[in-house]
């Protein structure tokens, strides 16, 4: 489809970077920013970062959240700063539902 083809000169965005792939940097530059949550042995591991090339994020960003993984993507400078990926509530599989709250 036409709208899924990468642009010749794609716009790059500054993204917050937090996680295993960030090294000592707290930001990265890419075509999309993301915020993710994965469950590792029952522990919540939150990460933020960027997809530097279009194809990298294309499939990941379209994957609906599962009980063990959720990714939310956005385009815009620092757009992932205030996004926290959330797991779906039982029986649902879309972003924006929360399985937990803080007490």
């Amino acid at each position: 489809m036409e709208d899924e083809k990468p642009k010749v000169n794609p716009k790059l965005y500054m993204c917050v970077c937090e996680g295993l792939s960030c090294g000592n940097e707290d930001h990265c530059e890419g075509q999309q920013c993301f915020s993710s949550l994965s469950i590792n042995d029952g522990f919540h591991v939150y990460q933020k970062g960027c997809f530097q090339v279009y194809e990298q994020g294309k499939m990941t960003c379209k994957t609906p959240p599962s009980p063990g993984q959720a990714v939310e993507c956005c385009q815009g400078d620092w757009c992932n700063r205030n996004i926290t990926a959330q797991l779906p509530t039982k029986g649902k599989s879309f972003p924006g539902t929360q399985n937990f709250h803080l007490e």
Epitope: I39, N40, F43, H44, P67, H101, E103
Partner: antibody, heavy 118, light 106 residues
Framework: EVQLVESGGGLVQPGGSLRLSCAAS????????MYWIRQAPGKGLEWISS????????YYPDSVKGRFTISRDNSKNTVYLQMNSLRAEDTAVYYC???????????WGQGTLVTVSS | DIQMTQSPSSLSASVGDRVTITCKAS??????LNWFQQKPGKAPKLLIY???SLQTGVPSRFSGSGSGTDFTLTISSLQPEDFATYYC????????FGQGTKVEIK
């Protein structure tokens, strides 16, 4: 106030079984993952199991996989640890713990002692 | 599995001393690390989460730092109630604790 109270510990022979319970109060139990951690006498801490909010996903290290089973009853605000084929090296204080999503193992129970000996 | 190596395994210090405990991970764990304090016969108590965030109710003399493989717990001015054993814990993958550091009275 968050409270976690373990029970069910005791003396058991090698090869035997035991079921530990952890009664939770002071928070919405069904919203939280729960965990068991153990500590052998005079030794360090070892994570041994986790369970998700509805009990559908469970996690174990290789040291107890196939012998221990974690489960929960959200109607009773209780998490369990069924321990089978117990060995001398399973002798430990067993702690129940809870996390919030961004603060792992924020709260712990007082522990219950399991002794495996003939 | 990721190995967590704490040092020293024990130390002697006096009230008012600045105490530093280190924890080294065998591979990159970013900031997915907590510090716990344990006193004899008691359950561990969370002090620091996500490498450097102070748990609610924990005195500000405790602080944590580090990212990747090297982490530090610092007690800026040791108090009588701080004599205990301290453990680091990583949850990046295959959750593991360090072997502990016992802080004793000099």
């Amino acid at each position: 106030e968050v409270q976690l109270v373990e029970s069910g510990g005791g003396l058991v022979q090698p090869g035997g079984s035991l079921r530990l319970s952890c009664a939770a109060s002071g928070f919405t139990f069904s919203n939280y993952y729960m965990y068991w951690i153990r500590q052998a006498p005079g030794k360090g801490l070892e994570w041994i199991s986790s369970i998700n909010t509805d009990g559908g996903s469970t996690y174990y290290p290789d040291s107890v996989k196939g012998r221990f089973t974690i489960s929960r009853d959200n109607s009773k605000n209780t998490v369990y640890l069924q321990m089978n084929s117990l060995r001398a090296e399973d002798t430990a204080v067993y702690y129940c713990a809870k996390s919030t999503p961004n603060i792992p193992l924020a709260y712990w129970g007082q522990g219950t002692l399991v002794t495996v000996s003939s | 599995d990721i190995q967590m190596t704490q040092s020293p395994s024990s130390l002697s210090a006096s009230v008012g001393d600045r105490v530093t405990i280190t924890c080294k991970a065998s591979q990159n764990i970013y900031k997915y690390l907590n510090w716990f304090q344990q006193k004899p016969g008691k359950a561990p108590k969370l002090l620091i989460y996500y490498s450097n965030s102070l748990q609610t109710g924990v005195p500000s003399r405790f602080s944590g730092s580090g990212s990747g493989t090297d982490f530090t717990l610092t007690i800026s001015s040791l108090q009588p109630e701080d004599f205990a054993t301290y453990y680091c814990f990583q949850y990046s993958s295959g959750p593991t604790f360090g072997q502990g550091t016992k802080v004793e009275i000099k």
